[in-house]
């Protein structure tokens, strides 16, 4: 689609005569008829296949034609066409005399023709005007012409349609040859694809407008190169999306189990030493003078029963003091002024003379001790119970009452979390530092294999292209959660993503 433009410049008819040689009365009031048609080696009459146009009266006898002539005419004359310009043409220009105001062909006498010229040849589309002058015996016509494309048409023959746009369907202007020239920030065949923020990750990122970087699910950050940990993750990170790799001191599927209770909670009081002993469990080793699971209780100096031979103990600011019974003396009432004659041995103890009767020694029956067999044996004085266990005297023996999670005569063994068979439906239990883990048989899942899942439809790895597989519990079938760029029940078909 384009326009053949004809610019009339000057017409000379000095004698003011018609083609027949007869003069015009009073002068030749001149107008033009133009016929544009396909190329003919010999231009013949016939339909104006490329179009025709007439002018109003432009002047009398000889005159110059101004651009955009007044009187309703247009100069240059426009002959539009809506086909591919063939590159060749034929042009007929007729000058006519108008005796009256009616310029219609049927209203004019045939002898009103002043002159007729015909040219033909090649003409390329372009902005440059071709200047021409045609002379007959009595007249001369100077004119120029060219072919240009209509708005939105481009190319050598005005056949390429291109309309600049800046909307959802494209962001471009048109080059002279009709090719698209993308606006800044856009690319692709029709300039529909935005150029993302520089550095935006090719797989993990995309954009809907230039200089943007939006992340696909599982990725975060300015350039979408940082993964997002699992939704339930607490104290863990990831190297690929939805992972939960535990920080030091944390365990469990979601890194929510505290393996470093000592550091995170500092449970031991009064300067005690804390030792981690499994998930959420710890042991406090108390400094002298303190007791309790968390060493929270202050010991009295007299609690260790330092006074012997029935001496009574009194707490003092700087320690303790022993009040000795008659016949004894010393810091701990350990020295005696008695002999066997004074029957110093209690609880059935037998007395033996020493140093020629100057002193004695008591041999105590079972369960009694002390210089005079005055004390019941306390088998707990050596703190034999480990891991915070409580020591209890039971007649001639002792026993340890263990804290949860420990067993053995001295609470020395960590109870296996698996001992109570926590895994349901035949699950296999594994003792881990972070707690127990159940390996479930086919058809069961959950932390304790408590969830019936019938069969693991994902066992055969049916999903392609790194899709995530889930078992649909209602149908015992698998469901593939496709990554971006793939569709299909097994994520087997690639697609362009993301659709806008």
């Amino acid at each position: 689609s384009g326009v053949f433009q004809l610019q009339l410049q000057e017409f000379v008819n000095e004698r003011g005569v018609l083609a027949s040689g007869r003069p015009c009365e009073p002068g030749c009031r001149t107008f033009f008829r133009v016929c544009l048609k396909h190329f003919q080696a010999v231009v013949s009459p016939g339909p104006c296949t490329f179009g025709s146009v007439s002018t109003p009266v432009l002047g009398t006898n000889s005159f110059a034609v101004r651009d955009d002539s007044s009187g309703g005419g247009r100069n240059p004359l426009q002959l539009p066409f809506n086909f591919t310009w063939p590159g060749t043409f034929s042009l007929i220009i007729e000058a006519w005399h108008a005796p009256g105001d009616d310029l219609r062909p049927e209203a004019l006498p045939p002898d009103a023709l002043i002159s007729k010229i015909a040219i033909q040849g090649s003409l390329a589309v372009g902005q440059n005007w071709l200047l021409d002058e045609q002379t007959s015996t009595l007249t001369r016509l100077r004119y120029s012409y060219r072919v240009i494309c209509s708005d939105n048409y481009y190319g050598d023959n005005c056949s390429r349609l291109c309309k600049k746009r800046n909307d959802h369907f494209g962001h471009y202007v048109c080059q002279p040859d009709g090719n698209l020239s993308c606006l800044p920030g856009w690319t692709g065949e029709y300039c529909q694809q935005p150029i993302c923020l520089s550095g935006c990750h090719e797989q993990n990122g995309y954009c809907s407008k230039p200089a943007e970087c939006l992340c696909r699910p599982g990725w975060q950050g300015r350039l979408c190169n940082e993964c997002i940990p699992h939704n339930g993750c607490r104290h863990g990170t990831c190297s690929t999306p939805w992972q939960c790799t535990c920080d030091e001191g944390w365990g469990g599927l979601f890194c929510d189990q505290d393996l470093n209770y000592c550091t995170h909670h500092s449970p031991c009081k009064n300067g005690a030493t804390c030792s981690n002993s499994g998930q959420r469990s710890y042991t406090c080793t108390c400094r002298p003078g303190y007791t309790g699971v968390d060493c929270e209780l202050e010991l009295s100096e007299c609690d260790s029963n330092p006074c012997r031979n029935g001496g009574s103990c009194k707490d003092q600011e700087d320690g303790y003091h022993c009040l000795c019974p008659p016949g004894y003396y010393g810091l701990h009432c350990e020295h005696s002024t008695l002999s066997c004659a004074d029957s110093p041995c209690f609880n059935g103890g037998s007395c033996r003379e020493r140093n020629q009767g100057a002193s004695y020694a008591c041999e105590c029956p079972p369960n009694f001790t002390g210089s005079n067999c005055e004390k019941k044996v306390d088998r707990c004085t050596s703190n034999p119970c480990a891991n915070g266990g409580q020591c209890l005297n039971r007649g001639p023996s002792r026993m340890c009452r263990c804290r949860p999670g420990f067993t053995g005569t001295y609470c020395e063994r960590h109870v296996s979390d698996c001992a109570r068979n926590p895994c349901a439906h035949g699950g296999t239990c594994h003792d881990l530092e972070s707690g127990l883990m159940c390996t479930c048989p086919a058809g069961f899942s959950g932390r304790r294999c408590e969830v019936r899942t019938s069969i693991d439809a994902c066992a055969s790895s049916p999903c392609f292209n790194r899709a995530t597989c889930y078992t649909d519990l209602s149908t015992d079938t698998f469901v593939c959660n496709c990554p971006y760029g793939f569709v299909g029940s097994r994520c087997e078909f690639p697609v362009g993503l993301p659709p806008s």
Epitope: P217, G221, E226, I228, R234, Y470, P498
Partner: antibody, heavy 118, light 107 residues
Framework: EVQLVESGGGLVQPGGSLRLSCAAS????????MAWVRQAPGKGLEWVAT????????NYRDSVKGRFTISRDNAKNSLYLQMNSLRAEDTAVYYC???????????WGQGTLVTVSS | DIQMTQSPSSLSASVGDRVTITCRAS??????LAWYQQKPGKSPKLLIF???VLADGVPSRFSGSGSGTDSTLTISSLQPEDFATYYC?????????FGQGTKLEIK
């Protein structure tokens, strides 16, 4: 236990400013993207803004761009929303949530009410 | 923006009933869909993500399914504590968008 506690809501005049805060605990804050989601009285949920974990890159819904600023202090385990040029249509309960624009919001705070009225 | 349309907007049911709520996206969202439960005066709680994966601590009576543009939340046997408003959310496309909500009331 994951806990998100919002504060800073209140009554403000149109054109005014407000700064919301969210104190996070129970998870390693710096690893996780965070978001603000709002709910106008009697209406549904509407995403407002998100910020990534360590590089702190923000994204906003179109209606708040240029007026709201989301930020975080990973050392203090805190998330913030600076709201300027407030309008009546910004009136809502604002929730702090753990999540991103391309992931579910796994944990939510109790919300703080922002009322914009003259 | 992607439009998320929930149906029904409200629904009455009794304890023990099986209930289904549907969410339709204005275009394919590739299973990137979550469901939330919200009780009056409380914050939303994540129930299901990736269309069918149960969030930690959510009872197994809740389940999700769907593909393409249509997704469904099913509660197999309603309990008294399940009466609330439920929202769906897509997170495939930016910005993330929520459904208008479905209010589940006691009959």
């Amino acid at each position: 236990e994951v806990q998100l506690v919002e504060s800073g809501g209140g009554l403000v005049q149109p054109g005014g400013s407000l700064r919301l805060s969210c104190a996070a605990s129970g998870f390693t804050f710096r690893y996780f993207p965070m978001a603000w989601v709002r709910q106008a009285p009697g209406k549904g949920l509407e995403w407002v803004a998100t910020i990534s974990g360590s590089d702190e890159w923000p994204n906003y819904r179109d209606s708040v761009k240029g007026r709201f600023t989301i930020s975080r202090d990973n050392a203090k385990n805190s998330l913030y929303l600076q709201m300027n040029s407030l309008r009546a249509e910004d009136t809502a309960v604002y929730y702090c949530a753990r999540g991103y624009y391309n992931s579910p919001f796994a944990f939510w705070g109790q919300g703080t009410l922002v009322t914009v009225s003259s | 923006d992607i439009q998320m349309t929930q149906s029904p907007s409200s629904l009455s049911a009794s304890v023990g009933d099986r209930v289904t709520i549907t969410c339709r996206a204005s275009q394919e969202i590739y299973r990137n869909l979550a469901w939330y439960q919200q009780k009056p005066g409380k914050s939303p709680k994540l129930l299901i993500f990736d269309t069918s994966v149960l969030a930690d601590g959510v009872p197994s009576r809740f389940s999700g399914s769907g593909s393409g543009t249509d997704s469904t939340l099913t509660i197999s046997s309603l309990q008294p504590e399940d009466f609330a408003t439920y929202y769906c959310q897509q997170y495939t496309y930016y910005p993330p968008t929520f459904g208008q909500g479905t209010k589940l009331e006691i009959k």
